[in-house]
């Protein structure tokens, strides 16, 4: 999904679906700023480093991000 | 289930306006972004603009910028296209659209606007 | 700005496989939709993300992409096939992303 390059919000709709672990190259967190109000989560996908925006408020990705957060614990020494 | 109704078509004239509005219903409306997409008669789709989930970002095809503003009240489920300055390429069916992230998921059955010279 | 290119038609007998084709430059570095519209219909998703399928659309509507071009394909082709199928990706190089759609093609069963 395309992303805005302006110093507002970044995504164009948030997706209640999570999405595979194992398909993540990397998990953004934005937070709210004085630009965007809300805090905004940016999956990149290994497949193409295809953006997709993540909904905060969904359980499903509440529970995405504490296993993406889990697993990287387990791999810190 | 997922439903869009364009409304506010109909006949115009040349350099006038005509603002369209989309209902949407059956899905967080507040969470997704938006399209408008229209099609001449007899030919292809011609994407036009595109407004982000909560408004604070609008993207405009050439061919409109300027001329047509997107809008959204996501308080009312309502997605808006203002159109200024019609010309009579105008002419077309206009559909709103759902974004989901990449693909246009679900469309409306499209409302039809003729611009008369 | 960026540019796709479709076959204007495609025709193919009922049984038979259709090829589609969607041409763009490293249009194997985008993510790819197809939509199928019958005549007097809106457009219908029927591949999104190069090769995935929306629920309720058959199996045999699938989609794959090479470097310079995507190919939606379908197997064994109904009567009720006949439509117009138009490719679509969003267009980040630009100062604002776009949408942009591939002329169409006209897919006859004969």
């Known amino acids: 999904v395309p992303l805005s390059r302006t110093v507002r919000c970044t995504c164009i709709s948030i997706s209640n679906q999570p999405v595979n672990p194992r398909s993540l190259e990397k998990l953004e967190i934005i937070p709210a700023s004085q630009f965007c109000p809300r805090v905004e989560i940016i999956a990149t996908m290994k497949k193409k480093g295809e953006k997709r925006c993540l909904n905060p408020e969904s359980k499903a990705i509440k529970n995405l991000l504490k296993a993406v957060s889990k697993e990287r614990s387990k791999r810190s020494p | 289930q997922v439903q869009l109704v364009e409304s506010g078509g109909g006949v115009a004239h040349s350099g006038k306006s005509l603002r369209l509005s989309c209902a949407a219903s059956g899905f967080t409306f507040s969470n997704y972004g938006m399209h408008w997409v229209r099609q001449a008669p007899g030919k292809g789709l011609e994407w036009l603009a595109v407004?982000?989930?909560?408004?604070?970002?609008?993207y405009y095809a050439d061919s409109v910028k300027g001329r047509f503003t997107i809008s959204r009240d996501n308080s009312n489920n309502t997605l808006n296209l203002q159109m200024s300055s019609l010309r009579a390429e105008d002419t077309a069916l206009y559909y709103c659209?759902?974004?989901?992230?990449?693909?246009?998921?679900?469309w409306g059955r499209g409302t039809l606007v003729t611009v008369s010279s | 700005s960026y540019v796709l290119t479709q076959p204007p038609s495609v025709s193919v007998a009922p049984g038979q496989m259709a090829r589609i084709t969607c041409g763009g430059n490293?249009?194997?570095?985008?993510?790819v939709q197809w939509y199928q519209q019958r005549p007097g219909q809106a457009p219908l998703l029927v591949v999104y993300?190069?090769?995935d399928r929306p629920s309720g659309i058959p199996e045999r509507f699938s989609g794959s992409y090479s470097r310079n071009t995507a190919t939606l394909t379908i197997s064994r082709v109904e009567a009720g096939d006949e439509a117009d199928y138009y490719c679509?990706?969003?267009?980040?190089?630009?100062?604002?992303?776009?949408?942009?759609f591939g002329g169409g093609t006209k897919l006859t069963v004969l």
């Open positions: 679509q990706v969003w267009d980040s190089s630009s100062d604002h992303p776009e949408v942009v």
């Open positions: 407004i982000s989930y909560d408004g604070s970002n609008r």
């Open positions: 490293n249009i194997g570095d985008k993510s």
């Open positions: 659209a759902k974004d989901a992230g990449g693909p246009l998921d679900y």
């Open positions: 993300d190069d090769s």
